[in-house]
């Protein structure tokens, strides 16, 4: 794969900040007349003014009227103004507003419920496999293996709290040390960020919306990946998280607290428990090598049980196996002892859809996975539609200004930190970072929140989820209190360390720039979003897992060359953008690489051929299916309300729309093909609430 898509053009001229043909040399101004061979086109390349030398962004000569794709769209209110309405119109508009609010809350409710059921579905499909990942003995010695297990398990069960609680129970049972648990917690942090990335995929229908939503979601991914990239080696070398948290745990004499308040669950549980109920202890039992648990179903059948503790006589091979010398006897043939057994009597069955079907977990999981994704997608579309109709004109302006405006000078820097606190608070209220960041994603997509503002909110969400874990730890039983609290604190300090790395200094806010770069690529090549998801959350972790199982020699043998190549590419890119003169002529651009290694165009052709069956006609029963179809094939036909029609933005795809505002692409090489942009589609005349 290319280090970045379309790297051929990225050749700045330090003397004049000019960019021309791919083959252009800094010392040869005449070369500017050459043609651009990157995209195999004959079109001449025009010289344009480049960014300052610290930037690697490729810009295209642009007409002034085209906006930066990252600028928030202005949602025009074409409705009748409030002052111009008569009493009847005002009343009607008021009730329309109330109706929209109720609908919005309703869809938001089902959106959150579908996220919960999606998590249950993932647990049913991959929960047992996730549990078996934990039973791998190499975790103790290999932090990298611990990390990828954390990622894979959290991706499979769609819940960092589930994977964290498994880790806690394993540490409490001395099956895992806190040192070995820390990389797993880091991995769980990465794994939990997949949820909002999946949610972002649902906004694939509209390119500009998708660009923002996908970037807004992946800013979380990049923050987590970059934090791990820096902090895992630091932790392995210094064990600072382990030491700090140990000091905290030992210095406080904690008494068992109360359970963390379930605020959102109180509202969603009545509905979700009618769909499916899971026995999450099964995954923990599998992780702890309980053979019996492997045959147990995750689907909870009995909700009311009576547990009776009784003593039974059991035979033992010898008197040495007796519970105690005084509880040992013989019948003349066999030795007997008395054992305390807990007898569980089933009283009442659970009241959920799957209770009497007796289907295998995989079948139930698959059904729920499909249904929850459909509901998730449907709710998201409706939320975006309702928000789109409400957030227009004056309302949009007020909300956008409130959310995205900084404090006045000299306190502007405080705004982001307030956003972190808001994100943490909101996550604490909803008790799930996935729910909060997933709710944030469509708002970024429709342009209510900027990525710059979403970033601190997401960071706050990471903190919020750890405070919930700390509260839950304080409510743990005595034997698990220390370990669960230490792990929760490790999670907390890991996120704090990450924020200190990637937030305070604007220059270090790499996740924003990386997410924007990925947003641009994915907006142009929508299949790349799915590719990114599979690569980062499945293939890379699975590859590392496989290599780790093969032994550290294999891992090092494969890993070191890969890491070396990545570092080499990054260094080369840095030199190409900052001081290309020091490089040999051939290395001053990426043209020495074959096209498939520096551009996504050949790959796009392959994907297009592969999904050719969809490309001719994309008729489908609903928009939900259409979005999935668009994502797969980037087809020129998309559905609108049960009929096939030309998608306006697809029709304009041929026009490579130039891009403005270089500062937003700071340090990211963006190709022309990643910059297709259209104005937001015009809205119908509708009543605006307010």
């Amino acid at each position: 794969m290319a280090p970045w898509p379309e790297l051929g053009d990225a050749q700045p001229n330090p003397d004049k900040y000019l960019e021309g043909a791919a083959g252009q040399q800094p010392t040869a101004p005449d070369k500017s007349k050459e043609t651009n061979k990157t995209d195999n086109t004959e079109a001449p390349v025009t010289k344009i003014e480049l960014l300052p030398s610290y930037s690697t962004a490729t810009l295209i000569d642009e007409p002034t009227e085209v906006d930066d794709p990252w600028n928030l769209p202005t949602l025009q209110d074409s409705g009748i103004k409030w002052s111009e309405r008569d009493t009847k119109g005002k009343i009607l508009c008021f009730f329309q507003g109330i109706g929209r609010l109720i609908l919005l809350l309703g869809f938001l409710y089902f959106f959150v419920c579908s996220l919960d059921i999606l998590s249950s579905a993932f647990q049913l499909v991959g929960g047992k496999m996730a549990g078996q990942f934990f039973s791998n003995s190499s975790i103790m010695s290999n932090p990298l293996l611990g990390l990828v297990i954390g990622v894979l398990v959290t991706v499979l069960v769609q819940s960092s709290s589930t994977s964290t609680s498994i880790v806690v129970s394993m540490v409490s049972s001395s099956l895992l040390t806190v040192r070995a648990a820390i990389p797993i917690i880091m991995g769980a942090n990465i794994g939990t960020s997949i949820t909002n990335t999946i949610v972002a995929l649902m906004q694939v229908g509209d390119r500009s919306e998708f660009r923002r939503a996908f970037a807004g979601a992946t800013v979380h991914d990049f923050f987590n990946w970059l934090s791990v990239l820096v902090l895992l080696p630091v932790e392995v070398a210094t064990h600072y998280l382990e030491i700090i948290t140990q000091l905290i745990v030992e210095s406080f004499h904690f008494k068992n607290g109360e359970d963390a308040p379930d605020l959102l669950k109180v509202i969603t549980k009545p509905f979700t428990k009618l769909i499916v109920q899971l026995d999450k202890k099964v995954i923990s039992q599998i992780a702890m090598n309980d053979e019996k648990a492997k045959n147990k179903s995750l689907v909870k059948i009995w909700c009311k049980t009576f547990t009776n503790k009784t003593q039974i006589n059991v035979t033992v091979p010898s008197t040495a196996n007796c519970t105690s010398p005084s509880l040992c006897w013989t019948d003349g043939i066999q030795n007997w002892t008395m054992k305390n057994v807990t007898y569980k009597e089933n009283i009442a069955k659970c009241q959920h859809i799957f209770v009497n079907f007796h289907l295998p977990d995989l079948a139930v999981g698959t059904i729920l996975l499909i249904l929850s994704l459909l509901v998730l997608c449907g709710c998201l579309i409706m939320i975006v539609k309702i928000l789109g109709s409400v957030l227009k004109g004056q309302v949009a302006t007020v909300i956008k200004k409130t959310i995205n405006t900084d404090f006045p000078f000299p306190f502007a820097w405080l705004t982001g930190y307030l956003a972190i606190l808001v994100g943490a608070g909101m996550t604490f209220i909803v008790q799930s970072s996935s729910v909060f960041t997933s709710a944030l994603t469509p708002l970024i997509g429709i342009g209510v929140i900027t990525i710059e503002r979403a970033y601190p909110l997401t960071l706050g969400s990471n903190i919020g989820t750890t405070t919930t874990a700390i509260l839950a730890a304080l409510a743990s039983p005595g034997n698990a209190l220390r370990s669960s609290l230490q792990i929760a604190l490790c999670h907390f300090f890991f996120n704090i360390s990450g924020i200190l790395l990637w937030y305070p200094i604007p220059f270090t806010r790499l996740p924003i720039r990386m997410a924007k770069g990925l947003g641009n690529i994915s907006a142009k090549y929508r299949w790349f979003a799915v590719f990114y998801l599979i690569i980062f959350f499945f293939l890379i972790p699975l590859t590392v897992f496989g290599l780790s199982l093969a032994g550290w020699r294999v891992l090092v043998g494969v890993g070191v060359p890969v890491v070396f190549i990545i570092i080499l590419v990054l260094c080369l890119r840095l030199l190409q953008s900052r001081c290309p003169r020091v490089l040999p002529k051939k290395l001053q651009n990426w043209n020495f690489l074959p096209l498939w290694m520096r551009s996504l165009k050949p790959w796009d052709a392959v994907v297009s051929k592969f999904t050719g069956c969809f490309q001719m006609r994309c008729c489908c029963c609903c928009r939900v299916c259409c979005r999935a179809c668009c994502l797969l094939c980037d087809c020129p036909k998309c559905c609108r309300c049960s009929k096939c029609c030309e998608d306006l933005e697809e029709a304009q795809e041929g026009q490579d729309v130039p891009v403005k505002a270089p500062e937003t692409f700071d340090n990211i090489t963006i190709s022309r093909e990643a910059q297709g942009e259209v104005p937001a589609s015009d809205s119908k005349t509708e009543c605006t609430a307010l």
Epitope: P325, C328, W329, W336
Partner: antibody, heavy 120, light 107 residues
């Protein structure tokens, strides 16, 4: 009711073997362990061993190991105890007994006893 | 093997008297102790098991107590038919072992 009927008295020479039988009735033969206990004249009780007729599992007192063999015949609901290499100190009344108190070694039904005399 | 030491080896008392027989185990046997009564020329008869549980048909004047290593059989009011030899037995470990017996007579 439960009945344990033992074979008649035996007189044996030292070095010989004796096989005492215990025919049972009134209960399911394979259910309970059968114990053999002996009592030398004017002495206390001494446990020889036990057999579980259901599986043929046996357990012997180390003192008699290698000399004692217990067998069960489920077709006749009879248990046999054979003691070899007899010595004069083996002269005793041999009792078969069962424990219907499941899992315990407390025996609650006894045979009438078989007197085995070892003399040259 | 676990040794069971019974005392006294014999005792002579009057009808209606309270009789106490003790049994000491050489090691902890929990409560896995039984008491037997053997009349002259007869087979032993189970009186008590699990230290204190009376067997079916055993009169209530017979009671047992103790745990660990010290056990007691009490005949609250001696009757003429109680003249016999009494044995304690442990079934905590194989081999099962009996006490030497206590001969109870009436004066």
């Amino acid at each position: 009711q439960v009945q344990l009927v033992q074979s008649g008295a035996e007189v044996k020479k030292p070095g010989a073997s004796v096989k005492v039988s215990c025919k049972t009735s009134g209960y399911t033969f394979i259910t309970y362990n059968m114990h053999w206990v002996r009592q030398a004249p004017g002495q206390g009780l001494e446990w020889i061993g036990a057999i579980y007729p259901g599986s043929g599992d046996t357990s012997y007192n180390q003192k008699f190991k290698g000399r004692v063999t217990m067998t069960a015949d489920t077709s006749t609901s009879t248990v046999y105890m054979e003691l070899s290499s007899l010595r004069s100190e083996d002269t005793a009344v041999y009792y078969c007994s069962i424990s219907t108190i499941i899992t315990t070694g407390a025996v609650d039904y006894w045979g009438q006893g078989t007197l085995v005399t070892v003399s040259s | 093997d676990i040794q069971m030491t019974q005392s006294p080896s014999s005792l002579s008392t009057s009808v209606g008297d309270r009789v106490t027989i003790t049994c000491k185990a050489s090691q902890d046997v929990g409560t896995a102790v039984a008491w037997y009564q053997q009349k002259p020329g007869k087979s032993p008869k189970l009186l008590i098991y699990w230290t204190s549980t009376r067997h079916t048909g055993v009169p209530s004047r017979f009671s047992g107590s103790g745990s660990g290593t010290d056990f007691t059989l009490i005949i609250s009011s001696l009757q003429p038919e109680d003249v016999a030899t009494y044995y304690c037995q442990q079934y905590s470990r194989i081999p099962l072992t009996f006490g030497g017996g206590t001969k109870v007579e009436i004066k």
